[in-house]
Amino acid sequence: RKIPKVGHTFFQKPESCPPVPGGSMKLDIGIINENQRVSMSRNIESRSTSPWNYTVTWDPNRYPSEVVQAQCRNLGCINAQGKEDISMNSVPIQQETLVVRRKHQGCSVSFQLEKVLVTVGCTCVTPVIHHVQ
Amino acid sequence: RKIPKVGHTFFQKPESCPPVPGGSMKLDIGIINENQRVSMSRNIESRSTSPWNYTVTWDPNRYPSEVVQAQCRNLGCINAQGKEDISMNSVPIQQETLVVRRKHQGCSVSFQLEKVLVTVGCTCVTPVIHHVQ
């Protein structure tokens, strides 16, 4: 799913207020809901009919530093016999997410939001048209 | 996938530098990669063997204001005949993502990161145990 553009309103003060100095704003330390948990079914990436693997990318100047990307293992989907069914296709489910980029020069540290496209997993679909013309 | 805890390091300046004043830091306006595109406008949610619907939540004090949540339509998966196969399960694929929460009192505006759990779509899995004993 796509994150809409910021436009020029969300990060600005109300019109009646003095503008934000220097094109930056105040970000409070700490994260709301930091301790919430993901309750994903166990090993769904291996048990799915459109199974996937995970690759971890690491960047110490990004929060979260670890971003996990899924890659579908097959082109087709896995049938009840454990064979690849080529009439169905394993397709990636993608999600735009925000990360925070840290930029520093000496003791001057600033942060900026960054959009990252994450493949979260795969699902099995029926192509609209089965064959080329 | 789970976002690790911030700990006490990412948003802090190096030890040799003066501490961040008032528990806040500088967030630059603008978003890196704002124009990148998601190629997901293909109705996979309807054509998946584990189809899902979308619900949009809206909050003007959150960026992005619109957060889309998926809900699996069925317990089972849809077979080639378009019928629900209850030997297989439709399960949600969840992803922790960051949003920005806006807090304001008069002209004093600050922002804080918030973790949100998003269901991105669904996938069809083989249950670990098919039948109770």
Epitope: W52, N53, Q71, C72, R73, N74, L75, G76, K83, E84, D85, I86, S87, N89, S90, V91, P92, T119, C122, V125, P127, V128, I129, H130, H131, V132 | S39, R42, I44, R47
Partner: antibody
Framework: QVQLVQSGAEVKKPGASVKVSCKAS????????MHWVKQSHGQRLEWMGG????????SYNQNFKGKATLTVDTSASTAYMELSSLRSEDTAVYYC????????????????WGQGTTVTVSS | DIQMTQSPSSLSASVGDRVTITCSAS?????MHWYQQKPGKVPKLLIY???KLASGVPSRFSGSGSGTDFTLTISSLQPEDVATYYC?????????FGQGTKLEIK
């Protein structure tokens, strides 16, 4: 228009490896699968496998598992097929061929073909 | 794997003749494709989904069949039809092709 341009002919010694490239143009590379087909001395066509540049998904013909490795470089819109431990029976013309996008056409539907790359294995 | 057997392996016919090539699958398949490969050229899709004509293919070509037995027919052979014809099953992994039928003009 869609074009698939393959690398030139190769002559290799038994036991060596070879990597054949297929440069795509005229469409969005990431959105379509790429397949590889072997044709030995003008005879039967054998589907070797296919790869989805977007999802990373790969499907191999079991007969070519361990023999062929399919990869892509999305930034260069190029697909690669590497053959290892070459033997005389690997002497053939190898074709890359574009498959479907998985959404509107099936991944396994082949529409456009490269011009073919001749690999000769000889001591 | 599904084995595809074409017959005949080669045939010679006169311009204007009706030509039939058959393809037999080792087990039932839903769809059959037919490819034409002219000497020194790349394969070209001729018929897809058993009976549908691919874009730009002359109407003298037609396909039929179901289950395990499929047929490619050229209603009136033309000199430019000299080629090797391959059937390909699109049903079961892996994709498999027939061994080819080489068509020549008498």
């Amino acid at each position: 228009q869609v074009q698939l341009v393959q690398s030139g002919a190769e002559v290799k010694k038994p036991g060596a490896s070879v990597k054949v490239s297929c440069k795509a143009s005229g469409y969005t590379f990431n959105e379509y699968t790429m397949h590889w087909v072997k044709q030995s001395h003008g005879q039967r066509l054998e589907w070797m496998g296919g790869i989805n540049p977007n999802s990373g998904g790969v499907s191999y013909n079991q007969n070519f598992k361990g023999k062929a490795t399919l990869t892509v470089d999305t930034s260069a819109s190029t697909a690669y097929m590497e053959l290892s431990s070459l033997r005389s029976e690997d002497t053939a013309v190898y074709y890359c061929a574009r498959g479907g996008d998985g959404y509107y056409t099936n991944y396994f539907d082949i529409d456009y073909w490269g011009q073919g790359t001749t690999v000769t294995v000889s001591s | 794997d599904i084995q595809m057997t074409q017959s005949p392996s080669s045939l010679s016919a006169s311009v204007g003749d009706r030509v039939t090539i058959t393809c037999s699958a080792s087990s039932s398949v839903n769809y059959m494709h037919w490819y034409q490969q002219k000497p020194g050229k790349v394969p070209k899709l001729l018929i897809y989904d058993t009976s549908k004509l691919a874009s730009g293919v002359p109407s003298r070509f037609s396909g039929s069949g179901s289950g395990t037995d499929f047929t490619l027919t050229i209603s009136s052979l033309q000199p430019e039809d000299v080629a090797t014809y391959y059937c390909q099953q699109w049903n079961s992994h892996p994709l498999t092709f027939g061994q080819g039928t080489k068509l020549e003009i008498k």
